[in-house]
């Protein structure tokens, strides 16, 4: 039961995280106009990975896409790439993890295959989360650098556009969404990897014979089975001694040294 819960929770946390990474990538508020020096502007500027926007006090919002690819700074391109890689890996990880879920039965898929898939998706989630965190952090660093370097007619980190003297940018909501989402995806991936360990039977399984000797309950373990070629080849082996109540997961799993007292 604990394994299923860990796996399920890992999947849900990763799903939320990846949704957050997608949301952050699409959001326009990666950087927002710093209002510290001049809070009374009738125009509020904010910028995303794909376009920059203005919200006028008249109520109108206008956005302009970065229609150039070569004209954009390398750092912005790198952030875009990291976020997209994060989304792609996360999406593939989600797809793999759906089939790996213990609660979902697909044909005669063995638990060993599910364990491998769980581990694969877990690693994908971890890398996805790291990509998102890295992307957001690179952008944040770019903002901090530009904030202090901001002078009249300086080319900023956003598409080589002229930075007017009064417009300095600070962290936007998307950065925080990205950090949290990346963290969640990372945590979800770790949980999937932990769940994988519980799903996978050990290399050596022991047939246990229990008997009572001098008043003590002892588990006698004669020779082990020959190492199997795959995790799922010993499906016919049964435990001779059941040491007590088992959780649902333990009943379905293979014998291990922890099953005996």
């Amino acid at each position: 039961m604990a394994v299923t819960a860990c796996q399920g929770l890992g999947f849900v946390v990763s799903l939320i995280g990846i949704a957050g990474i997608i949301a952050a990538t699409c959001m326009d508020q990666w950087s927002t106009q710093d209002l510290y020096n001049n809070p009374v502007t009738a125009v509020f500027n904010y910028q995303g990975l794909w376009r920059s926007c203005v919200r006028e006090s008249s109520g109108f919002t206008e956005c302009r896409g970065y229609f150039t690819l070569l004209g954009l700074p390398a750092m912005l391109q790198a952030v875009r790439a990291l976020m997209i890689v994060g989304i792609v890996l996360g999406a593939i990880g989600l797809l793999v993890s759906i089939f790996a879920l213990k609660c979902i039965r697909i044909g005669s898929m063995e638990d060993s295959a599910k364990a491998n898939m769980t581990l694969t998706s877990g690693i994908m989630f971890i890398v996805s989360g790291l990509c998102a965190i890295a992307g957001v952090s690179v952008f944040a660093n770019m903002l901090v650098t530009n904030f202090w370097m901001s002078t009249a007619n300086m080319y900023t980190g956003m598409g080589g556009m002229v930075q007017t003297v009064q417009t300095r940018y600070t962290f936007g909501a998307a950065l925080f969404v990205g950090w949290v989402a990346g963290g969640l995806t990372l945590i979800g991936g770790v949980m999937m990897c932990i769940a994988c360990r519980g799903l996978a039977p050990e290399e050596t399984n022991y047939k246990a014979v229990s008997y009572h000797a001098s008043g003590h309950s002892v588990a006698y373990k004669p020779g082990g089975f020959k190492a199997s070629t795959g995790f799922g080849s010993n499906t016919k082996n049964k435990k001779i001694y059941d040491g007590g109540a088992r959780t649902e997961d333990e009943v379905q799993s293979y014998p291990s040294k922890h099953d005996y007292v």
Epitope: S52, C53, S58, E62, V162, Q163
Partner: antibody, heavy 117, light 113 residues
Framework: EVQLVESGGGLVQPGGSLRLSCAGS????????MSWVRQAPGKGLEWVSS???????YYLDSVKGRFTISRDNAKNTLYLQMNSLRAEDTAVYYC???????????WGQGTLVTVSS | DIVMTQSPDSLAVSLGERATINCKSS????????????LTWYQQKPGQPPKKLIY???TRESGVPDRFSGSGSGTDFTLTISSLQAEDVAVYYC?????????FGQGTKLEIK
């Protein structure tokens, strides 16, 4: 056709109060940012106050604390409550709608406020 | 506050001739978000409220004759009337719409020579 009609102007003594109204027809004032602009006799234009979405208000420094901009959505009317009036507040007061580029595109005909003893 | 300075204060131009009015802002009005300049030109005839001619420094208001054009960026702007007509006699104002308080130029009185 969009029309903005100001009213409430008149002669008032220094230190007195007036409430200007701007009634809109052919336009729902609550959906737009609105402004008051004044023009002293023979002088240029001077922005006085604006109210934008969410009821956020902005004022010229010289009228801050004395003037209050507000609107009544049910009556489709914009107001400018003017207290502690001074001689330098004498002007024609216009209400105007803010539109693209924060520009004032529709203006009323104005109402004259005279502050004199 | 942003100071808007118009030049000249008054201008006399012959009918059919070009009229040019300048406006200078004490700070850049260019928005980095949409690359637009937040400057508006108004025309005011005696006894009438102002009328918007140009917004975003160069975008002509619908219904405004195409002889009126706006140009400039950052801090320096120009209103040009390519061929002056009798009905163009008025006072012209520039206004910055970027910062509060919104400020106007002192106005330029355009007359026929």
């Amino acid at each position: 056709e969009v029309q903005l009609v100001e009213s409430g102007g008149g002669l008032v003594q220094p230190g007195g109060s007036l409430r200007l109204s701007c009634a809109g027809s052919g336009i729902t004032l609550s959906t737009y940012a609105m402004s008051w602009v004044r023009q002293a006799p023979g002088k240029g234009l001077e922005w006085v106050s604006s109210i934008i979405s969410g009821g956020i208000t902005y004022y010229l420094d010289s009228v801050k604390g004395r003037f209050t901009i507000s609107r009544d959505n049910a009556k489709n009317t914009l107001y400018l409550q003017m207290n502690s009036l001074r001689a330098e507040d004498t002007a024609v007061y216009y209400c105007a709608r803010k539109y693209h580029g924060n520009a004032l595109d529709y203006w009323g005909q104005g109402t004259l406020v005279t502050v004199s003893s | 506050d942003i100071v808007m300075t118009q030049s000249p204060d008054s201008l006399a131009v012959s009918l059919g001739e070009r009229a040019t009015i300048n406006c200078k802002s004490s700070q850049s009005l260019l928005s980095s978000g949409n690359q637009r300049n937040y400057l508006t030109w108004y025309q005011q005839k005696p006894g009438q409220p102002p009328k918007k001619l140009i917004y975003w420094a160069s975008t002509r208001e619908s219904g405004v004759p195409d002889r009126f054009s706006g140009s400039g960026s950052g801090t320096d702007f120009t209103l040009t009337i390519s061929s002056l007509q009798a009905e163009d006699v008025a006072v012209y104002y520039c206004q910055q719409n970027y910062f509060y308080p919104l400020t106007f130029g002192q106005g330029t009185k355009l007359e026929i020579k």
